[in-house]
Amino acid sequence: FKNDATEILYSHVVKPVPAHPSSNSTLNQARNGGRHFSSTGLDRNSRVQVGCRELRSTKYISDGQCTSISPLKELVCAGECLPLPVLPNWIGGGYGTKYWSRRSSQEWRCVNDKTRTQRIQLQCQDGSTRTYKITVVTACKCKRYTRQHNESSHNFESVSPAKPAQHHRERKRASKSSKHSLS
């Protein structure tokens, strides 16, 4: 089975994936993300996403010798975006142009909006089963950042996915660093 897969979505409304709770210890996990998109203008060819760029992540979760029975699905909120109030002015200037001229002091980024606690089962090599709670992202939102924000709060870095089984080939991806916790 695959270690992870990502489907890029550009929807504004996302139904929660059937998944769900909170915890204490760290869970080794695969995490998918997106490239950091930047743009210098508000033209039709801009690579800044309208609304939020949502990645549908599918991954297996591993805890030592135990691996999730099924892959877990969740959203990864990544990249730059435009808030919905700006969208009507996307073409033809107006407020959108004024907003964009201030980009040096503020930017909009796609961040986690809604999360859900999810119980999952892990199958262990010794035949036993474990259960944990993790937190999964179910919706993204466009949030404004200014120079006052710590740059590291929305930087991207390279993260290695978890290897749920020995035969899984490790693949590096640029992603937001984030860890699920167990309880």
């Epitope: 769900h20 204490n24 099924s70 119980r119 999952i120 036993s128 474990r130 259960t131 944990y132 167990l182």
Partner: antibody, heavy 123, light 107 residues
Framework: EVQLQQSGPELVKPGASVKISCKTS????????MSWVKQSPEKSLEWIGE????????TYNQKFKAKATLTVDKSSSTAYMQLKSLTSEDSAVYYC????????????????WGQGTSVTVSS | DIQMTQTTSSLSASLGDRVTISCRAS??????LSWYQQKPDGTVKLLIY???RLHSGVPSRFSGSGSGTDYSLTISNLEQEDIATYFC?????????FGGGTKLEIK
Amino acid sequence: EVQLQQSGPELVKPGASVKISCKTSGYSFTGYYMSWVKQSPEKSLEWIGEINPTTGGSTYNQKFKAKATLTVDKSSSTAYMQLKSLTSEDSAVYYCAREGYYSGISYDAMDYWGQGTSVTVSS
Amino acid sequence: DIQMTQTTSSLSASLGDRVTISCRASQDISNYLSWYQQKPDGTVKLLIYYTSRLHSGVPSRFSGSGSGTDYSLTISNLEQEDIATYFCQQGNTLPRTFGGGTKLEIK
């Protein structure tokens, strides 16, 4: 076959404590959260809390946080609930109920229930 | 906490009838809605999870539907063994909460 066998009825005095057991069989005990539910005529069904048999960590309904303590004994695949400082309002039937999983994912339903333990608080 | 309301506390129906029991949540519960059957002897069984998915071993005459805040359980061809009290339960947000129950009786 999955089975949750609860301990017998209890008649206790006000102010006392009681410990109810739920012995499980037919499945991997550590692979499923265990919930406890109270049923009284006045309040229908109320979720008390849940415990993760893997870690022993528990989550409580705020209403029962000072009343109930959930524990497990992995060696005997048994879950326990202790109720303290009992009053007449604690007189009810208490159920243990296993978290349901479908292909390893929970949909927050309880798929198997014990037969219930009646607790009567009376002087 | 999310309030779950079953407006009909009891209803009478004839064998063979199609019966629908409704349940309303005080806020959107994203389909995390389960239905349970409690027999007169106190035995509780899960019927439906995640709004419409049938738990293993449950007869196909039971079905569930709904979305947002409004959900329902339907028994398509009422049988004697279906005489029980039915509870809905939301699992979208902790604490889990239950409806007050609907007692089903034979007319």
